[in-house]
C-alpha cells in the first residue's frame, strides 16, 4: 500500500487556446485530471487502473502551481494504491478550460481539452521527485512525481507491512525496508525474547523481562551460575544441583560427620601436637610440664621425679634443683660416688660392679626402677591409652579409663552399634559417636531401612524435554531441570513461541 | 508536417557493427516513446526495441538483447540503434516509430535496409 | 510472451465485398491491440487502436471490435485501394507481437 504523489509545477498557455487551435474566452481557465494506470508497452485509451484524481481550477492561461501540502491542500495530488508497487506505469495528464463551475467531464463540451500528456515512467518507491516536462506547440507542463509507501508499509514495493509495538506479541520498531528492529532489550525474530541480566547463565537462568535473571530449579545466585547443594548438606559444595561434595575433613551422607576434630576444634591445649584417631576421635601428645587429655594440665617440673638415686627435688622459678643423697652428685643425683660394698640398690635390687669396681649397675626386681630400684614403676608414662583415655596406676599394673563410644584395654575399640545388625533390607551400618545411621538401598528408606518406598524418582522419566531429572534424596521426589525454552515443574510449557503473524 | 528519417542502413559482414539513426521533426520529439520495428524480406513486422520519452526504460526482443543498444537525443530530435555482432538473421528494413494510441500518435519513418552477408 | 494468431493468412474478395480478419492473444491484453495496413515497399499504416477506435482519417468502412483475447478486424465494403497485408498488434506487454499478416488479394 502506498501513494503516487504528483506535483504540478507550471503551466504554459501563452496563447489561451485550446487544443483545437481556439482561444478561451475570456482566458482558459485550466484544471487537471490525473489517470495512473499500469505500464503499457504503447499508451493505449483504458481504464485508469491505479487511480484517478481531479484538480479544481488552479489558473488561467499560464501560471504556477502552488505547493499545497503543508496547508492540506491538494498539490501534490495524491492517488493511492493498495497493492505492491510494480516499478512502471503510464500516466495520462489531461488540462481542461472550465467555462463555468460544473468540472464533471460530462459537463464540459469535448473540445474544452487545451492539452493532454501521456507517458510510460519507471520510478521505484522512495526515490527523490522526478522531474519532467512536456512540451507542445502551444502549451508547455512542469510536473515531477514520487511513490511513498503509507503508513506500516515498506519495502521496495511497499508490500511489507510493519507496525511498531510494544506489547507481548513483540518490542520493535520497523526499519525503512520493513525489517523488525527490536527495542532495547529484546531479541528474536519478533523480538519476544527478552535479553536477560548480562551474564546471566544460559540453561541456568531465564527472564520475562530485560535485565532480569531468574533461576530454574536447582540454581542460585545473581546469574544462576551457583547450584544448590543437597537439602541439609553441612560441609560439602555441588558441581550440579542436589550435590553434596564434602569439604576436606568432613565425611557421611550431609558431610557432617567430622574427619578432621584436630583442624576443626583444636582440642589439644598448650602447643600440643594433635592426632586425627578416627570419627571426632583424636589424641593429644603434650609437650613438657603438661599433662591431661587435652594437656590442659599444668605439671610442677618435679612431678616427672627428675632426681635420681633417692635425690629429693625443689621446685624453683626458672626450673628444679635436686638435692643428692650422700654418695651421689650431679644435676640429676645420676653420679654415683658409691660402690656395691656401699648396698646401694634398694627394693631387693641387685647389685652388679662396673669399670673395676669404680662404678655399678643395680638390677631391679618388677615394679622398681631407677638406678638404685629406688622409684616404682609408673606404667602410664608411655601413655598407653588411645581415643583420650585417662591411664591410672593400679600397682603393678595399670588400667585405661576410656572417653564414651570406646572400649579395649587401651581404649583402641570403638563401641560399636552396629554389631547387632540394625540396618534392615541390606542397609549399610555406620558407626556415630552417640549412636548409628543407616545407609539404605534403593527402595527403602527410615531410621533403619524399614520402610519401602519408590526405587527412583527419576526412573519414571517425568521430565519433558529433554530435560535433566535428578532425585531429591531427602523426599524421595525429583526435579527437573529444564533446557532453554521451556518451563514448569516437568518442563512441559514453551516459553512464549510466536504466533506465525503476530498482527 | 511530421517526419522520421532512418538512415546508416547498408550492408555489413557478419560479426560487424552498424549504427542506425532516426531524425525527428514536425512533433515534439521529446514527449513520447519511440520504437524500433523491422520486416525481414517476404516476411511479417517484428518489434525490436523500445525507449521511454526521457531514455529511463528500455527495452528489446530477446534475439538482439545484449547485441544492440537503443538511445536518444533529445536536444538533437534523434534516434539511434547501435548494432552490434550483426547475424544474417538480422538482415531486414529497420523502421522508427513514434507510437501513443493514447493521443492518437502513430508516426513511422520510410525504413532502411540491413543486408548481414559474408 | 504474448502470441498473436491472426487468421486467416490470406483471403481472395471482390471489391464491395465485405471482409473479417481475426485476431487471438495468448493471454488477456484488455483492449491494447492496433490494426495496420501495409502495402509494398511503405511502412506500416495504423487504422484502429484501442480495438475499435477509428484513427484519424481512416474511412469508416473499417471498424474493429473485441477485447481480452479475441479481435475482429471488418471492412464493410472493399475498395480496389484496401487491397494490402493487415497486421494485428498487441501493445499490452513487451516484446511487442504483431500477428503474422492477413494478405487480401483481388478475386
Known amino acids: 500500500s502506498g501513494v503516487f504523489q504528483l506535483q504540478l509545477q507550471e503551466f504554459i498557455n501563452e496563447r489561451g487556446v485550446l487544443a483545437s487551435g481556439r482561444p478561451c474566452e475570456p482566458g482558459c481557465r485550466t484544471f487537471f485530471r490525473v489517470c495512473l494506470k499500469h505500464f503499457q508497452a504503447v499508451v493505449s485509451p483504458g481504464p485508469c487502473t491505479f487511480g484517478t484524481v481531479s484538480t479544481p481550477v488552479l489558473g488561467t492561461n499560464s501560471f504556477a502551481v502552488r505547493d499545497d501540502s503543508s496547508g492540506g491542500g491538494r498539490n501534490p495530488l495524491q492517488l493511492p494504491f493498495n497493492f505492491t508497487w510494480p516499478g512502471t506505469f503510464s500516466l495520462i495528464i489531461e488540462a481542461w478550460h472550465a467555462p463555468g463551475d460544473d468540472l464533471r467531464p460530462e459537463a464540459l463540451p469535448p473540445d474544452a481539452l487545451i492539452s493532454k500528456i501521456a507517458i510510460q515512467g519507471s520510478l521505484a518507491v522512495g526515490q527523490n521527485w522526478l522531474l519532467d516536462e512536456q512540451t507542445s506547440t502551444l502549451t508547455r507542463l512542469r510536473y515531477s512525481y514520487r511513490v511513498i509507501c503509507s503508513d506500516n508499509y515498506y519495502g521496495d514495493n511497499c508490500s511489507r507491512l510493519c507496525k511498531k509495538r510494544n506489547d507481548h506479541f513483540g518490542h520493535y520498531v520497523c526499519q525503512p525496508d520493513g525489517n523488525l528492529s527490536c527495542l532495547p532489550g529484546w531479541t528474536g525474530e519478533y523480538c519476544q525474547q527478552p535479553i536477560c541480566l548480562s551474564g546471566c547463565h544460559e540453561q541456568n537462568g531465564y527472564c520475562s523481562k530485560p535485565a532480569e535473571c531468574l533461576c530454574r530449579p536447582g540454581w542460585q545466585g545473581r546469574l544462576c551460575n551457583e547450584c544448590i547443594p543437597h537439602n541439609g548438606c553441612r560441609h560439602g559444595t555441588c558441581s550440579t544441583p542436589w550435590q553434596c561434595t564434602c569439604d576436606e575433613g568432613w565425611g557421611g551422607l550431609f558431610c557432617d560427620q567430622d574427619l578432621n576434630y584436630c583442624t576443626h576444634h583444636s582440642p589439644c591445649k598448650n602447643g600440643a601436637t594433635c592426632s586425627n584417631s578416627g570419627q571426632r576421635s583424636y589424641t593429644c601428645t603434650c609437650r613438657p610440664g603438661y599433662t591431661g587429655v587435652d594437656c590442659e594440665l599444668e605439671l610442677s617440673e618435679c612431678d616427672s621425679n627428675p632426681c635420681r638415686n633417692g635425690g629429693s627435688c625443689k621446685d624453683q622459678e626458672d626450673g628444679y634443683h635436686c638435692l643428692c643423697p650422700p654418695g651421689y652428685y650431679g644435676l640429676h643425683c645420676e653420679h654415683s660416688t658409691l660402690s656395691c660394698a656401699d648396698s646401694p640398690c634398694f627394693n631387693g635390687g641387685s647389685c652388679r660392679e662396673r669399670n673395676q669396681g669404680a662404678n655399678y649397675a643395680c638390677e631391679c626386681p618388677p615394679n622398681f626402677t631407677g638406678s638404685n630400684c629406688e622409684k616404682k614403676v609408673d606404667r602410664c608414662t608411655s601413655n598407653p591409652c588411645a581415643n583420650g583415655g585417662q591411664c591410672l596406676n593400679r600397682g603393678p599394673s595399670r588400667m585405661c579409663r576410656c572417653r564414651p563410644g570406646f572400649t579395649g584395654t587401651y581404649c583402641e575399640l570403638h563401641v560399636s552399634d552396629c554389631a547387632r545388625n540394625p540396618c534392615a533390607h541390606g542397609g549399610t551400618c555406620h558407626d556415630l559417636e552417640n549412636g548409628l545411621m543407616c545407609t539404605c538401598p534403593a527402595g527403602f528408606s527410615g531410621r533403619r531401612c524399614e520402610v519401602r518406598t519408590s526405587i527412583d524418582a527419576c526412573a519414571s522419566s517425568p521430565c519433558f524435554n529433554r530435560a535433566t531429572c535428578y532425585t531429591d534424596l531427602s523426599t524421595d521426589t525429583f526435579v527437573c531441570n529444564c533446557p532453554y525454552g521451556f518451563v514448569g515443574s516437568r518442563c512441559e510449557f514453551p516459553v512464549g513461541l510466536p504466533p506465525s503473524f503476530p498482527w | 508536417e511530421v517526419q522520421l528519417v532512418e538512415s546508416g542502413g547498408g550492408v555489413v559482414q557478419p560479426g560487424r557493427s552498424l549504427r542506425l539513426s532516426c531524425a525527428a521533426s514536425?512533433?515534439?520529439?521529446?514527449?513520447?516513446?519511440m520504437y524500433w520495428v523491422r520486416q525481414a524480406p517476404g516476411k511479417g513486422l517484428e518489434w525490436v526495441a523500445f525507449?521511454?520519452?526521457?531514455?529511463?526504460?528500455?527495452y528489446y526482443r530477446d534475439s538482439v538483447k545484449g547485441r544492440f543498444t537503443i538511445s536518444r537525443d533529445n536536444s538533437k530530435n534523434t534516434l539511434y540503434l547501435q548494432m552490434n555482432s550483426l547475424r544474417a538473421e538480422d538482415t531486414a528494413v529497420y523502421y522508427c516509430?513514434?507510437?501513443?494510441?493514447?493521443?492518437?500518435?502513430?508516426?513511422w519513418g520510410q525504413g532502411t535496409m540491413v543486408t548481414v552477408s559474408s | 510472451d504474448i502470441q498473436m494468431t491472426q487468421s486467416p493468412s490470406s483471403l481472395s474478395a471482390s471489391v464491395g465485398d465485405r471482409v473479417t480478419i481475426t485476431c487471438r492473444a495468448s493471454?488477456?491484453?484488455?483492449?491494447?491491440l492496433a490494426w495496420y495496413q501495409q502495402k509494398p515497399g511503405k511502412a506500416p499504416k495504423l487504422l484502429i487502436y484501442?480495438?475499435?477506435r477509428l484513427q484519424d482519417g481512416v474511412p469508416s468502412r473499417f471498424s474493429g471490435s473485441g477485447s481480452g483475447t479475441d479481435f475482429t478486424l471488418t471492412i464493410s465494403s472493399l475498395q480496389p485501394e484496401d487491397f494490402a497485408t493487415y497486421y494485428c498488434?498487441?501493445?499490452?506487454?513487451?516484446?511487442?507481437?504483431f500477428g503474422q499478416g492477413t494478405k487480401l488479394e483481388i478475386k
Open positions: 516509430a513514434a507510437l501513443n494510441w493514447e493521443l492518437g500518435i502513430d508516426y
Open positions: 514536425g512533433f515534439t520529439f521529446s514527449n513520447y516513446g
Open positions: 525507449i521511454s520519452h526521457g531514455g529511463g526504460i528500455t
Open positions: 493471454e488477456d491484453i484488455y483492449s491494447n
Open positions: 484501442a480495438a475499435n
Open positions: 498488434l498487441q501493445g499490452s506487454k513487451f516484446p511487442l507481437t
